[in-house]
């Protein structure tokens, strides 16, 4: 059943004498593997023999291959699916039909393939898009129905016989569906390519010419124009005439309309290739071009810049910037319409010519108040001198100048006085609107620029004012020089550092923090009694009697100030000790006798010791020594010793006499 054989391959293959042919081929024999294969050239079926007659180009059997006379034919297939063939080289007489006779164990099949071999290499074919427009990218395709592994070829693009710079992409196909070599070239044609010849050249591997195909480019483009002007430099004076001519150098398709444009705007009623301008004015200066349209679109010529020359017009001055701040930089610009541009300028400040200023711009790097005023200028070119315009006003702003703080009071100022100060200045732009004072205080400003300080303080040392417009200018501080009585008067112990002991050398200092005027006098007093007039009060050897409350006074021409009372405490060891006896120094035996150790001490005595006439200490340590009942043997001299934190003191001897009672005398 022959329907079981299925083949796929190109219907016809093309080649030329000396090249090669590669035949991609697949098959399927459903009943088993291929056992015999014969390649016929123009096979014909012989009914008598029931076999095919024809030239056998290749034969293979299950016994092995029959040696081919030429090794030029190769079966590259296999026993079940591949039937690819190669003929190398291929000859003109190979043209015709190739027959592939296939036999399996039970089935046979003859598959026919057409082979077209030309005498010379056939040309490739160039394919162009239906329309080509300037500057639009197109793809040019060159197709050749040939490809063979054993015979490399190349396709080259030429424009007017010169290789094209653009890179082409070459692709080959050797499949059961198609066999070809293709080159694609991406290309953006310009209007100048219109009518030019493009060639696709087939070359062998060595670059040798084999064949080619050519096409003429039809590049659609807008009209290409040239503009001519009389006079050629397009520079005229007012009243002259000017002629402009528009020439079309190329247009595809043909042009349809003509128009003229000035500065990008269409000129009415100007639809011919010539533009005549009679008695031109300066307003006709500008950029001219012609515009011609076709179906692709409008084309424009290059612009011609028509310059109508005239003398400078009245000038104006532009100031960068006004108002200007003193110290800043300012630029003046003289603006005057003129053609050609002015070559010389004359500048005026308040009507007076500014020497050495001949440029369009005047730059003042550091503006001062006197630069204020009206600035004007005159421009000049080859056609004449312009008129001086109205000018521009420069306003120079600056902080208030020469600010001073002035004390209105008679001097000297005393603590507690009312002080009036004024803030004066020399000049200001803009006007002074407010004043500031340093230091700040709860002070009155009865009018602008006047400060009233009620009850001026001793420590109001300096005052400064500022006059303010947009800026504040401070005056140098003015010294109020307030005079006041001495302040913070206090007594300070210089010597000793800590406790004062009787007998010490003591120095007290009368301190004060400040005084104005500086010249002062000192007074020391104790209990209302004047002690001295020096800053120091000295005791060569202090005694307990010096203890008490001390004050010092410091006075100057304004007044006097007293210190707080300062207590001078003198510590001393017990003194003036004496033993007192109660009821008396003569006591009858059996009665009670009390001895008291009296003393003067600071701090008070903390410890007492009693001694008898033998200087024997008695076992008593309190201030009183009580003898009860008193005996005659108690008669004798007693003394006591007192101790405090400073030291000890002793009393003189005191004699106690104990006499016998009448009972004792009676018993004797």
């Amino acid at each position: 059943d022959s329907s079981k054989w299925v083949f796929e391959h190109p219907e016809t293959l093309y080649a030329w004498e000396g090249a090669c042919v590669w035949i991609p081929c697949t098959y399927r024999a459903l009943d088993g593997d291929l056992e015999s294969f014969i390649l016929f050239h123009n096979p014909e079926y012989n009914k008598n023999t029931s076999k095919f007659d024809g030239t056998r180009l290749y034969e293979s059997t299950k016994d092995g291959k029959v040696p081919s006379e030429q090794k030029r034919v190769q079966f590259l297939g296999d026993k079940n699916k591949n039937c690819t063939l190669s003929i190398h080289p291929v000859h003109l007489n190979d043209s015709g039909q190739l027959g592939l006779r296939m036999e399996s164990k039970t089935e046979k099949w003859m598959e026919r393939i057409h082979l077209n071999v030309s005498e010379r290499p056939f040309p490739p074919h160039i394919q162009l898009p239906p329309e080509i427009q300037e500057s639009q990218e197109v793809t040019l395709t060159c197709l050749l129905n040939f490809s063979c592994y054993g015979y490399p070829i190349q396709l080259q693009w030429l424009l007017e016989g010169v290789p094209m710079r653009q890179a082409a992409v070459t692709s080959t196909s050797l499949t059961i569906k198609s066999v070809f070599t293709r080159s694609e070239l991406k290309f953006s044609p310009q209007w100048s390519h219109h009518g030019k010849i493009v060639t696709c050249q087939l070359q062998d591997a060595d670059g040798k010419f084999l064949s080619n195909d050519t096409v003429q480019l039809n590049v659609k483009h807008t009209p290409k124009l040239e503009i001519k002007v009389t006079p050629s430099d397009a520079i005229v004076r007012e009243g002259d005439s000017v002629t402009m001519t528009c020439e079309v150098s190329s247009s595809n398709p043909e042009y349809t309309t003509v128009s003229w444009l000035k500065d990008g705007t269409s000129l009415k009623k100007q639809n011919t290739f010539t533009l005549n301008l009679r008695e031109v004015t300066k307003d006709q200066s500008g950029k001219y071009c012609c515009q011609v349209s076709n179906d692709v679109g409008p084309g424009r010529s290059e612009e011609v810049f028509l310059q109508v020359q005239y003398a400078p017009e009245p000038s104006t001055v532009q100031i960068l910037h006004s108002p200007a701040v003193e110290g800043s930089q300012v630029e003046f610009l003289c603006m005057s319409l003129a053609n050609p541009l002015p070559t010389n300028y004359t500048w005026y400040h308040n009507g007076k010519e500014m020497q050495g200023r001949t440029e369009e711009k005047v730059h003042i790097p550091k503006i001062l108040p006197w630069h204020a005023g009206t600035y004007s200028c005159v421009a000049e070119n080859i056609l004449g001198t312009g008129q001086r315009g109205p000018g521009a006003e420069l306003d120079v702003q600056y902080p208030p100048k020469k600010v001073t703080t002035v004390i209105q009071n008679p001097m000297p100022i005393r603590e507690g006085d009312t002080v009036t100060l004024s803030c004066n200045y020399n000049s200001s732009n803009p006007s002074v609107t407010r004043y500031e004072w340093k230091p700040h205080g709860a002070w009155e400003e009865p009018s602008l620029g006047v400060l009233k300080i009620q009850n001026v303080g001793w420590d109001n040392t300096t005052i400064a004012c500022a006059a303010c417009n947009s800026w504040c200018s401070w005056a140098s501080p003015v010294a109020l020089n307030v005079q006041y009585a001495p302040r913070d008067v206090r007594v300070r112990k210089i010597k000793p550092l800590s406790e004062i002991h009787s007998g010490n050398s003591v120095s007290l200092q009368c301190d004060f923090s400040s005084s104005h005027p500086k010249e002062v006098q000192f007074f020391w007093e104790k209990n209302g009694r004047l002690l001295g007039k020096e800053s120091q009060l000295n005791f060569d050897s202090i005694s307990p009697e010096d203890a008490g409350s001390y004050s010092c006074w410091v006075n100057n021409s304004i007044g006097q100030t007293a210190s707080k009372a300062w207590t001078l405490e003198v510590l001393y060891a017990p003194r003036r000790l004496r033993v007192s006896m109660s009821p008396g120094d003569q006591v009858m035996e059996g009665k009670s006798a009390t001895l008291t150790c009296e003393s003067d001490a600071n701090p008070p005595v903390s410890h007492y010791t009693w001694f008898d006439w033998n200087n024997q200490s008695l076992p008593y340590h309190s201030q009183k020594l009580r003898l009860e009942p008193v005996k005659v043997q108690h008669s004798g001299a007693y003394w006591c010793q007192g101790t405090n934190s400073v030291g000890k003191g002793r009393s003189p001897l005191s004699t106690l006499t104990v006499y016998y009672s009448p009972e004792t005398i009676g018993r004797r």
Partner: antibody
Framework: AVQLQQSGVELVRPGASVKLSCTGS????????IHWVKQRPEQGLEWIGW????????EYASKFQGKATITADTSSNTAYLQLSSLTSEDTAVYYC????????WGQGTTLTVSS | DIKMTQSPSSMYAFLGERVTITCKAS??????LTWFQQKPGKSPKTLIY???RLVDGVPSRFSGSGSGQDYSLTISSLEYEDVGIYYC?????????FGGGTKLEIK
């Protein structure tokens, strides 16, 4: 200003005695007691005793009774501390001080007892 | 003899910190207490006497307080120059007795 000037460094052998001096300037030593204070290396302060230069009265801490003797010479405005039977325990800085609660101090005399 | 117990024996404190040193007497001393500061190699310097009276010229950050047996020295805001050893002294009775000392250092 009240100043107390003490004698210089003393290096003595154990068992010996030493007499340290303390001279007042800008004040009369009779004005107040002269106290003596001991400070052993890296130790605290110890009160030895005082003298009242006006009358020669003295008072000692019980620890220094028999070890220290304080005297004064008002004509030279100087007080003295004599230390007897010296041992290494007596190695110390000895200060004299006067006035109030020890207001003014001498610079100290360093005594080293070493064989 | 009156025994003076001082605490702490040593302490570290930060600059600006408030520092308090205490002294306890074995019996009442009637505020007869002095505080001294001693720096290495120098003689002691009187800061406060009679428990709370500041010696002229001593910075006001030093203050003293107390009565009876308990007394303290306070430095309100410690400064670099305050490092040293601080001693208390009672002068209420003979013999005079010192506290054992407090060594103050900066942390």
């Amino acid at each position: 200003a009240v100043q107390l000037q003490q004698s210089g460094v003393e290096l003595v052998r154990p068992g010996a005695s030493v007499k340290l001096s303390c001279t007042g300037s800008d004040f009369n030593i009779k004005e107040d007691y002269i106290h003596w204070v001991k400070q052993r290396p890296e130790q605290g302060l110890e009160w030895i005793g005082w003298i009242d230069p006006e009358n020669g009265d003295t008072e000692y801490a019980s620890k220094f009774q028999g070890k220290a003797t304080i005297t004064a010479d008002t004509s030279s405005n100087t007080a003295y501390l004599q230390l007897s039977s010296l041992t290494s325990e007596d190695t110390a800085v000895y200060y004299c001080a006067t006035y109030g609660s020890l207001d003014y101090w001498g610079q100290g005399t360093t005594l080293t007892v070493s064989s | 003899d009156i025994k003076m117990t001082q605490s702490p024996s040593s302490m570290y404190a930060f600059l600006g910190e408030r520092v308090t040193i205490t002294c306890k007497a074995s019996q009442g001393i009637n505020s007869f207490l002095t505080w001294f500061q001693q720096k290495p190699g120098k003689s002691p310097k009187t800061l406060i006497y009679r428990a709370n009276r500041l010696v002229d010229g001593v910075p006001s950050r030093f203050s003293g307080s107390g009565s009876g047996q308990d007394y303290s020295l306070t430095i309100s805001s410690l400064e670099y120059e305050d490092v040293g050893i601080y001693y208390c002294l009672q002068y209420d009775e003979f013999p005079r007795t010192f506290g054992g000392g407090t060594k103050l250092e900066i942390k």
